[in-house]
């Protein structure tokens, strides 16, 4: 409507006792420059006098009359565009409607702005994303509908009462569209943050507490598990029994399924929180864990390495290299499956014990013709002595010896 003055400013401004209020404001008059400006508090139109009644907070007229409130209220505008105002300090009884009475040479206008002044600093508001998942970065937002050039404030983030280490980005807006102070914190919550209290604290320039808002984190996470084993060292002998128990220390939402894995492969028909292994064999040695799932996904416990100990199995001998040339070096390796590893070896050459050879490997620095033959070994560990395997044949190649002519 071309018969109206055009104003732009926030609809309502918020402050508290003793703070200040900065009112960003622009206008366009119907004709000519502004000649008179009066700022009313809760103006009411008097039909009898055809004028507005109310407390005059500020007055700027041709004759220069100025109310005593003038020191507290500043008109920072001009005669044709800017109608920005500042009230510093602002008081509780300033709450209500501010009326901007504007007069040009031929036209008059009353523009109303709402001012909400609280007794104490009002709390900021924490905004969280609709869902928070562990290890996924989220942005926490703390918003306060307040900003004023004459009253610096700060917003601080706390987790369980302790300042958060992550760097927050604070921004302020003092525009005709909005007035606010906002702090944004990028944060990768862990499952252990579930149920923890996050606080956004409003402080003055000196760090003095003014108000706060708190939220409880709801961090969706896969089940967190603890595995317990009896015996606790997970070292048993063949024929012993083993019990593993899976405990859910945390799950959000609640868990739905349970399974057990050995060496990464699921064990069939094992869907309870207890895994009983009776009369274990050495084939059951391996890495065990439990897996519990919820709507977020599967959670796995740490792995338990089950060691089923047994005496050495019949040994085999590997020869590097056969056939060997006389004078070359040869290495023999005794191979025997055992748990724990063998601690002692006995070596045989053509069935006769090789004195002083008690290690897994035997080196012969220079091979001679009489070193040819069958090499075998026996491995020994704390559980017993293995059997001598078939052995390996060393062939020694050598030049002719003691050539005689017939």
């Amino acid at each position: 409507d071309s018969s109206k003055w055009v104003f732009e400013h926030p609809e309502t401004l918020y402050a508290w006792e003793g703070a200040c209020v900065w009112i960003p404001c622009t206008y366009r008059a119907l004709d000519g420059d502004l000649e008179s400006f009066i700022l009313f508090h809760n103006p009411e139109y008097n039909k009898n006098t055809s004028k507005f009644d109310g407390t005059r907070l500020y007055e700027s007229t041709k004759d220069g009359k100025v109310p005593s409130e003038q020191k507290r209220v500043q008109f920072l505008g001009d005669k044709n565009k800017n109608c920005t105002l500042s009230i510093h300090p602002v008081h509780l009884n300033d709450s209500g409607q501010l009326g901007l009475r504007m007069e040009s040479k031929t036209e008059k206008w009353m523009e109303r702005i709402h001012l909400n002044v609280s007794e104490r600093p009002f709390p900021p508001h924490i905004q969280l994303p609709p869902e928070i998942q562990e290890s996924q970065e989220v942005t926490l937002t703390c918003l306060l509908n307040f900003s004023c050039y004459g009253y610096p404030i700060q917003l601080q983030w706390l987790l369980e009462g302790v300042p958060m280490r992550q760097a927050a980005v604070t921004s302020t807006s003092l525009t005709i569209k909005s007035v606010f102070t906002r702090s944004e914190l990028k944060f990768s919550p862990q499952w252990s943050h579930h149920g923890k209290i996050v606080t956004c604290q409003l402080q003055d320039a000196d760090g003095k507490f003014l108000s706060n808002d708190t939220v409880q984190l709801n961090v969706k996470h896969t089940p967190k598990l603890e595995i317990k084993v009896t015996p606790s060292d997970a070292i048993v002998r063949e024929g012993d029994s083993v019990t593993m128990t899976c405990e859910v220390s945390s799950s959000n939402p609640e868990y739905t399924t349970v399974s057990w894995l050995k060496d990464g492969t699921s064990l069939k028909k094992q869907n309870t929180f207890t895994l009983n292994l009776r009369e274990v064999t050495k084939d059951q040695s391996g890495k065990y864990c439990c897996q519990v799932s919820n709507d977020v996904g599967p959670g796995r416990s740490e792995e338990v390495f089950l060691q089923v100990q047994y005496a050495p199995e019949p040994s085999t001998v590997q020869i590097l290299h056969s056939p060997a040339v006389e004078g070359s070096q040869v290495e023999f390796l005794c191979m025997s499956l055992a748990n724990p590893l063998p601690t002692n070896y006995t070596w045989y050459h053509n069935g006769k014990e090789m004195q002083g050879r008690t290690e897994e490997k035997v080196h012969i620095p220079k091979i001679l013709p009489w070193h040819a033959g069958t090499y075998s070994c026996v491995a020994e560990n704390i559980l017993g002595t293995g059997q001598r395997g078939p052995g390996a044949e060393l062939d020694v190649q050598y030049p002719p010896k003691k050539v005689t002519t017939v």
């Epitope: 006389e326 004078g327 090789m354 004195q355 002083g356 050879r357 290690e359 035997v362 080196h363 012969i364 620095p365 220079k366 001679l368 013709p369 009489w370 070193h371 050598y398 010896k401």
Partner: antibody, heavy 124, light 110 residues
């Protein structure tokens, strides 16, 4: 009975080449598992292994002296030779030859029989 | 080049057991060092005792034995006799050369 006997010049001057001979009996260097090595002992000090040679012509040298040493054998004469080039006073020592053998039924070598040594003095 | 270290001197009595050790500056002595032990008696009389860490040379008395103790080679004389008074040298093989130790003087107090 195995015996080894060293022989050398007794005295020689710096920068000359020292030639040593080890004559042995009671074994042959054509027999598998037999070797002869040279070891020296400066007066009042420890032993220093120099080189050894096996029946199959395998030769091994002390890395610190390798450029100056040459070991060789004459199997038919039962002799092993060691040459040390460009001698210095630090080469003054008693030089021993020793049999290094892998006896029948064994898998390792032994410095089993030694000569009584020959004294060499390098002097200007 | 490696340095082979031995005790400079040890004293024992007849019938007692004495152990001599041989350390390598390059780390633990292993069977791949084929430790040899040589005895020197007065008048430069040398005799080989042990080869390949723990094998007695033919004709060497059974009271002499070789072994590995921890990271060192060892020569043990079990039931020392007065004629065992001598200097004992160890020699270690380093893939293509021997290095002798400085020798241990063993005194058998009669």
């Amino acid at each position: 009975q195995v015996t080894l006997k060293e022989s050398g010049p007794g005295i020689l001057q710096p920068s000359q080449t020292l030639s040593l001979t080890c004559s042995f009996s009671g074994f042959s260097l054509s027999t598998s598992g037999m070797g002869v090595g040279w070891i020296r002992q400066p007066s009042g000090k420890g032993l220093e292994w120099l080189a050894h040679i096996w029946w199959d012509d395998d030769e091994y040298y002390n890395p610190a002296l390798k450029s100056r040493l040459t070991i060789s054998k004459d199997t038919s004469k039962n002799q092993v030779f060691l040459k040390i080039a460009n001698v210095d006073t630090a080469d003054t020592a008693t030089y021993y030859c020793a049999r290094i053998s892998i006896p029948y039924g064994y898998y390792d070598w032994f410095f089993d029989v030694w000569g009584t040594g020959t004294t060499v003095t390098v002097s200007a | 080049q490696a340095v082979v270290t031995q005790e400079s001197a040890l004293t024992t009595s007849p019938g007692e057991t004495v152990t001599l050790t041989c350390r390598s500056s390059t780390g633990a002595v292993t069977t791949r060092n084929y430790a040899n032990w040589v005895q020197e008696k007065p008048d430069h009389l040398f005799t080989g005792l042990i080869g390949g860490t723990n094998n007695r040379a033919p004709g060497v008395p059974a009271r002499f034995s070789g072994s590995l103790i921890g990271d060192k080679a060892a020569l043990t004389i079990t039931g020392a006799q007065t004629e065992d008074e001598a200097i004992y040298f160890c020699a270690l093989w380093y893939s293509n050369h021997f290095i002798f130790g400085s020798g241990t003087k063993v005194t058998v107090l009669g």
